[in-house]
């Protein structure tokens, strides 16, 4: 099948890093500078991504693969392939229309990115607040008041769960 296809379409023989040049009798020509083809049989090469401004180059463009960008310090990636850079804030803050602002009372953010989330409502689970929440930390829920008898040992606060939202895709 491959041989049949290559007889029908000479471009299918062109490997990654080249393109099938219609202006030169469909011979395989290397991709020009600042362009690439990641698969064989392509009739054009794609322009390399340029990492400018708040973007910085994580991986240089080659003839067979696009450049990869990340963000300069003080910013973090958003979107597939780091399509956007978003400003970092401090813990206890979130990025708003007017820049980094403290979390409103009753909400917290324990990271330099993301949004302020409401404190856990311990009473919904029939528990009491063991440690009050802050702008940077969620409340820690303990046993229900009825469970706390004199001399009962205090509950060790659980380690906070990792905030979702930082895995690819």
């Amino acid at each position: 099948f491959e041989r049949t296809r290559s007889l029908q379409d000479p471009c299918s023989n062109c490997p990654a890093g080249t393109f099938c040049d219609n202006n030169r009798n469909q011979i395989c020509s290397p991709c020009p500078p600042n362009s690439f083809s990641s698969a064989g049989g392509q009739r054009t090469c794609d322009i390399c991504r340029q990492c400018k401004g708040v973007f910085r180059t994580r991986k240089e463009c080659s003839s067979t693969s696009n450049a990869e960008c990340d963000c300069t310090p003080g910013f973090h990636c958003l979107g597939a392939g780091c399509s956007m850079c978003e400003q970092d804030c401090k813990q206890g803050q979130e990025l708003t229309k007017k820049g980094c602002k403290d979390c409103c009372f009753g909400t917290f953010n324990d990271q330099k990115r993301g949004i302020c989330r409401p404190w856990t409502n311990c009473s919904l689970d029939g528990k009491s607040v063991l440690v009050n929440g802050t702008k940077e930390r969620d409340v820690v829920c303990g046993p229900s008041p009825a469970d706390l008898s004199p001399g009962a040992s205090s509950v060790t606060p659980p380690a906070p769960a990792r905030e979702p939202g930082h895995s690819p895709q």
Epitope: E86, C104, G165, Q169
Partner: antibody, heavy 120, light 107 residues
């Protein structure tokens, strides 16, 4: 590709409970908050709450507190929304939607929706 | 809880520009995201993070913001843009609210 597939339509009697499932695929399930939104016939969208699939933590809209429970099973990448003490005005299409990551929260993608009909 | 107000209905001539607005106190702090919903279908995200479009959303859709009002603009409206449009934002307590919805008719 990222996809959310919900369970099928349900018919319930007033006072009963309903549990709707939302199976996620194409991404790391524990990496993104999941929200639930409902839409009554001919009406607008109404936010119900979210679950953090990593920790199981939840936040419910005040209107639904005491009646809604959001849970998840990370082993099968599925989120659940259970609504109890159903009334006729709970008849609606219920959607799950994944929260995007960023300073501006957004919902993408959405499940196809589950019609819950409450009728005696 | 905070509210987001939209015009119930807006119409636009084919190929013309239309602006759909969303007004609310929370929009002084947060940007809205925008959703398109066609009859019998789930909502689809069209604008997020100020003025970003998900892949597959045409560049005739754009977002803007001023004071307590965010706007969705469709430049050169097409017949397939006829739908309901909803804005969404968080409030200061960390909850979410949808706008009342705008029915767009393309004439």
């Amino acid at each position: 590709q990222v996809q959310l597939v919900q369970s099928g339509a349900e018919v319930k009697k007033p006072g009963a409970s309903v549990k709707v499932s939302c199976k996620a695929s194409g991404y790391t399930f524990t990496g993104y908050y999941m929200h639930w939104v409902r839409q009554a016939p001919g009406q607008g969208l109404e936010w119900m709450g979210w679950i953090n699939p990593n920790s199981g933590g939840t936040n419910y809209a005040q209107k639904f507190q005491g009646r809604v429970t959001m849970t998840r099973d990370t082993s099968i990448s599925t989120a659940y929304m259970e609504l109890s003490r159903l009334r006729s005005d709970d008849t609606a299409v219920y959607y799950c939607a994944r929260e995007g990551v960023g300073a501006t929260s957004w919902f993408d993608p959405w499940g196809q929706g589950t019609l819950v009909t409450v009728s005696s | 809880s905070s509210e987001l107000t939209q015009d119930p209905a807006v119409s636009v001539a084919l190929g013309q520009t239309v602006r759909i607005t969303c007004q609310g106190d929370s929009l002084r702090r947060y940007h809205a995201s925008w959703y398109q919903q066609k009859p019998g279908q789930a909502p689809v995200l069209v604008i997020y993070n100020k003025n970003n479009r998900p892949s597959g959303i045409p560049d005739r859709f754009s977002g803007s913001s001023s004071g307590n009002t965010d706007s969705l603009t469709i430049t050169g409206a097409q017949a397939e843009d006829e739908a309901d449009y909803y804005c969404n934002s968080r409030d200061s307590s960390g909850n979410y609210v949808f706008g009342t919805g705008t029915k767009l008719t393309v004439l």
